[in-house]
C-alpha cells in the first residue's frame, strides 16, 4: 500500500454523563487510515497534570491501513480547560502534523442554519451599483461562532465588526453582511459564508443566477422613419443586436441587398448595458428611391458565441395605404400651473404603421425630446393611431400662440405630410372661442365625466355638450374620453375643456 496520512478525530464524553463531583476525566484522540506505522501522539494539557496512554495500532481489515487511539486522563479544574492532541506521521512527511483542540466533554447543541440572502434588483430588473449579501446564522445553541466570507474558495478581507447576534429563548441568531461591487457580482464568482461552531463547519454559497429563462442573443432590424425618408431624404435602417455576452470575440454585422447591388458604408456603435450585456448597433444609409421601389435589405450577424448566424431583413411594408387624420387640442389652464400648458395631438386611421410626428412653433421644428409620442397602436378598424403630447410655456405662446402638429406618412398627399395648428387660447388668438376650426369632440378625463365642462378662454360650453362614455370610433387609451356635441340643427359648438 502507498503512504497515507492519518485522519484525526477527538474522542470526548457527553458533559451530562460526567458526574459533577468527578475529580478526574479521560479524553482521547483517534488517528486512523494511515500507512505505514508509526504515528506519534502528544498532548498539550495547559496548566493541568495528565497521564497519557497510547494503545497499540490495529490494522483496518479492508484497506490494510492502521488506526490507533491515545488516551489522556486529567485531574483538577478540567471543566474550563482546552486540550490539544498533536498527531505526527513522519512517513507522510517529516513535518506532517495534525492538531485537534477540544474540551473534556461535548455539550448537546443545536447546530446553526446558514442561509445567504441577496439584495434585490432595481425596478427595471437590473443590478444596482452595489449588491448586499446577508449571511443569516440562525437557531443555534448560544456559543462562540466564527464567520468567514470566501470568494471562489479564498478567504476575503471583510470587516466582521458589523456582525450582530440576537437571542430568542434558548437559541441564538447572528447575521453578517457583505457588500460587493456590481462588477464583482457580475463576474460570476461564488461567494460563501462559512461558519465554525463547536468544531464543526457550516456554510452556504451563492452566485449571480443565470437567467431562469435565458433569451439568448436577439437581433432586430428597423425600417427608415418617414421623416428621414420623405423630409430629410436621407433614410437609414438600423440593425440592433442585444443580449450579447461581453467577450474577446467581436460581433460581425454584414449588410446586403436582395438585388445583389452594393450597399453603402455603415456606422457601428457598441454599448455596455447595466445588466452586463453588450448591445451593438449598425446603421446603414439606404437610397430613398431604392427603398420606395421595394428593395430588401439584410443584416447578417455572426459571433463566436452564436451557434448560428442570425439574419434579419427589412423592406417597405406591403398592403393597403391610408393617410392619417390629425386632430390637435390644448388643455385648459390648470390651477397651480398658469405658465405651462399641454398640447395633445391625435393621429389616427393611417396605414401602414410607419409614421413620424413633429411639432413646430414659429415655423421651426421643435426638438424630438420636447414631445412624447406613443408607439402606433391598432384601431378597432384596420388602421393605426398615435397620441403625441407637447408641453409649452407661457413665453412661447405669448411670443406666438400657434403650434403645429405634423404627421409624416407615405400615404399623405401631396407631400407626405398632414398638419394641424392649435392655440393655447383659441378665443384670444383667432378671434372668438366659437371659431370653426376644431372637431366636434375633445379630450376629457373620464374620471370626472359627470361634471360640467370648464371652457377655455372664458367661453361657456353648450348645455347639451356632455361627456360620452367613450365613442366606439374613438380609439384613445382608456384614460381618455370624448365630449360629444349633441346640439341638433345648430352650428357646432366648439370648446376645449375638462369634463
Amino acid at each position: 500500500a502507498s503512504t497515507q496520512s492519518p485522519s484525526v478525530f477527538p474522542l470526548t464524553r457527553c458533559c451530562k454523563n460526567i458526574p459533577s463531583n468527578a475529580t478526574s476525566v479521560t479524553l482521547g484522540c483517534l488517528a486512523t487510515g494511515y500507512f505505514p506505522e508509526p504515528v506519534m501522539v502528544t498532548w498539550d494539557t495547559g496548566s493541568l497534570n495528565g497521564t497519557t496512554m497510547t494503545l497499540p495500532a490495529t490494522t483496518l481489515t479492508l484497506s490494510g491501513h492502521y488506526a490507533t487511539i491515545s488516551l489522556l486522563t486529567v485531574s483538577g479544574a478540567w471543566a474550563k480547560q482546552m486540550f490539544t492532541c498533536r498527531v505526527a506521521h513522519t512517513p507522510s512527511s517529516t513535518d506532517w502534523v495534525d492538531n485537534k483542540t477540544f474540551s473534556v466533554c461535548s455539550r448537546d447543541f443545536t447546530p446553526p442554519t446558514v442561509k445567504i440572502l441577496q439584495s434585490s434588483c432595481d425596478g427595471g430588473g437590473h443590478f444596482p451599483p452595489t449588491i448586499q449579501l446577508l449571511c443569516l446564522v440562525s437557531g443555534y445553541t448560544p456559543g462562540t461562532i466564527n464567520i468567514t466570507w470566501l470568494e471562489d474558495g479564498q478567504v476575503m478581507d471583510v470587516d466582521l465588526s458589523t456582525a450582530s447576534t440576537t437571542q430568542e429563548g434558548e437559541l441564538a441568531s447572528t447575521q453578517s453582511e457583505l457588500t460587493l461591487s456590481q462588477k464583482h457580482w457580475l463576474s460570476d464568482r461564488t461567494y460563501t459564508c462559512q461558519v465554525t461552531y463547536q468544531g464543526h463547519t457550516f456554510e452556504d454559497s451563492t452566485k449571480k443566477c443565470a437567467d431562469s429563462n435565458p433569451r439568448g442573443v436577439s437581433a432586430y432590424l428597423s425600417r427608415p422613419s418617414p421623416f428621414d425618408l420623405f423630409i430629410r431624404k436621407s433614410p437609414t435602417i438600423t440593425c440592433l443586436v442585444v443580449d450579447l455576452a461581453p467577450s474577446k470575440g467581436t460581433v460581425n454585422l454584414t449588410w446586403s441587398r436582395a438585388s445583389g447591388k452594393p450597399v453603402n458604408h455603415s456606422t457601428r456603435k457598441e454599448e455596455k448595458q447595466r445588466n452586463g450585456t453588450l448591445t451593438v448597433t449598425s446603421t446603414l444609409p439606404v437610397g430613398t428611391r431604392d427603398w420606395i421601389e421595394g428593395e430588401t435589405y439584410q443584416c447578417r450577424v455572426t459571433h463566436p458565441h452564436l451557434p448560428r448566424a442570425l439574419m434579419r431583413s427589412t423592406t417597405k411594408t406591403s398592403g393597403p395605404r391610408a393617410a392619417p387624420e390629425v386632430y390637435a387640442f390644448a388643455t385648459p389652464e390648470w390651477p397651480g400651473s398658469r405658465d405651462k400648458r399641454t398640447l395633445a395631438c391625435l393621429i389616427q386611421n393611417f396605414m401602414p404603421e410607419d409614421i413620424s410626428v413633429q411639432w413646430l412653433h414659429n415655423e421651426v421644428q421643435l426638438p424630438d425630446a420636447r414631445h412624447s409620442t406613443t408607439q402606433p397602436r391598432k384601431t378597432k378598424g384596420s388602421g393605426f393611431f398615435v397620441f403625441s403630447r407637447l408641453e409649452v410655456t407661457r413665453a412661447e405662446w405669448e411670443q406666438k400662440d400657434e403650434f403645429i402638429c405634423r404627421a409624416v406618412h407615405e400615404a399623405a398627399s401631396p407631400s407626405q405630410t398632414v398638419q394641424r395648428a392649435v392655440s393655447v387660447n383659441p378665443g384670444l388668438a383667432g378671434g372668438s372661442a366659437q371659431s370653426q376650426r376644431a372637431p366636434d369632440r375633445v379630450l376629457c378625463h373620464s374620471g370626472q365625466q359627470q361634471g360640467l365642462p370648464r371652457a377655455a378662454g372664458g367661453s361657456v360650453p353648450h348645455p347639451r355638450c356632455h361627456c360620452g362614455a367613450g365613442r366606439a370610433d374613438w380609439p384613445g387609451p382608456p384614460e381618455l374620453d370624448v365630449c360629444v356635441e349633441e346640439a341638433e340643427g345648430e352650428a357646432p359648438w366648439t370648446w376645449t375643456g375638462l369634463c
Epitope: 439568448g216 439584410q298 455572426t302 448560428r308 448566424a309 442570425l310 439574419m311
Partner: antibody, heavy 119, light 110 residues
Framework: QVQLVESGGGLVQPGGSLRLSCAAS????????MTWVRQAPGKGLEYVSI???????WYANWASGRFTISRDNSKNTVYLQIDSLRAEDTATYYC?????????????WGQGTLVTVSS | DIQMTQSPSSVSASVGDRVTITCRAS??????LAWYQQKPGQPPKLLIY???TLASGVPSRFSGSGSGTEYALTIRSLKPEDFATYYC????????????FGGGTKVEIK
Amino acid sequence: QVQLVESGGGLVQPGGSLRLSCAASGFTLSNHDMTWVRQAPGKGLEYVSIINTYGNHWYANWASGRFTISRDNSKNTVYLQIDSLRAEDTATYYCARETHHGSSGIDHWGQGTLVTVSS
Amino acid sequence: DIQMTQSPSSVSASVGDRVTITCRASRSIYSGLAWYQQKPGQPPKLLIYDHSTLASGVPSRFSGSGSGTEYALTIRSLKPEDFATYYCQHADYAHHSDNVFGGGTKVEIK
C-alpha cells in the same frame, strides 16, 4: 451542386464508440454553420449538435458529455464522435447545412448514416 | 430552452383538401421558424423559412404564417405528393436547446 455524405455508422455494442464523418462538397464549408440531427426508427427529428463558422459548438442538453462535434474546413469534413453508446442512440444521423445567411433553418441534408447499438 | 409543440400529430385528408398544421413555441420567437417535409426513407426538405418565406423550388400552395408563439403551415390544395410528415423547427436559437424541432405531423390519405 451541394452534397453532404455521411459515413461511419454501423452496428456497435453498448458502451462502444463511433466517429461519424460528413464529407461536404459543392460549397465553401467554412461559410456555414453545420448541424447534426438524428432520427430514431419511426420517430421524429432530434437536434444533436451545432458547430458555428468559428468552430464553437453547442449540444442538446441530453447530448452534452458523450457527443463531440468538430470540423476540418481544409478537409471539407464535419465529424460527430459518440462515446458510451446506448441502445437509445440507435438512429439515422443526418449531417445538415445551415443556410448561409442564418436563422432560416437547414437548406441541405445528407442522406443519413444508420447507427445501431445492440449487444 | 424553447420547446416546440406541433399539432395535430396526424391528419387524414384527401387530394384537393386544405390542411393546416400548427406549431406552438414555449416562448416568443422573433424570427427563424422553419417548416420541413419528410417522406419515408428520405432526409427532410426545407419548405419555409423565416415564418413565411418559401424556399426555392417549393410550390406556392404551401404557405407559412404566425408570429410570437403561434405558427401555422397551410397546404392550400393537397396533391398526391404532399402526403408526408411535416416538422417545424425553431431555427433562431442563440443557445442550445433540448430539441428545436416539433414532434411532427403525419399527413395521410383519407
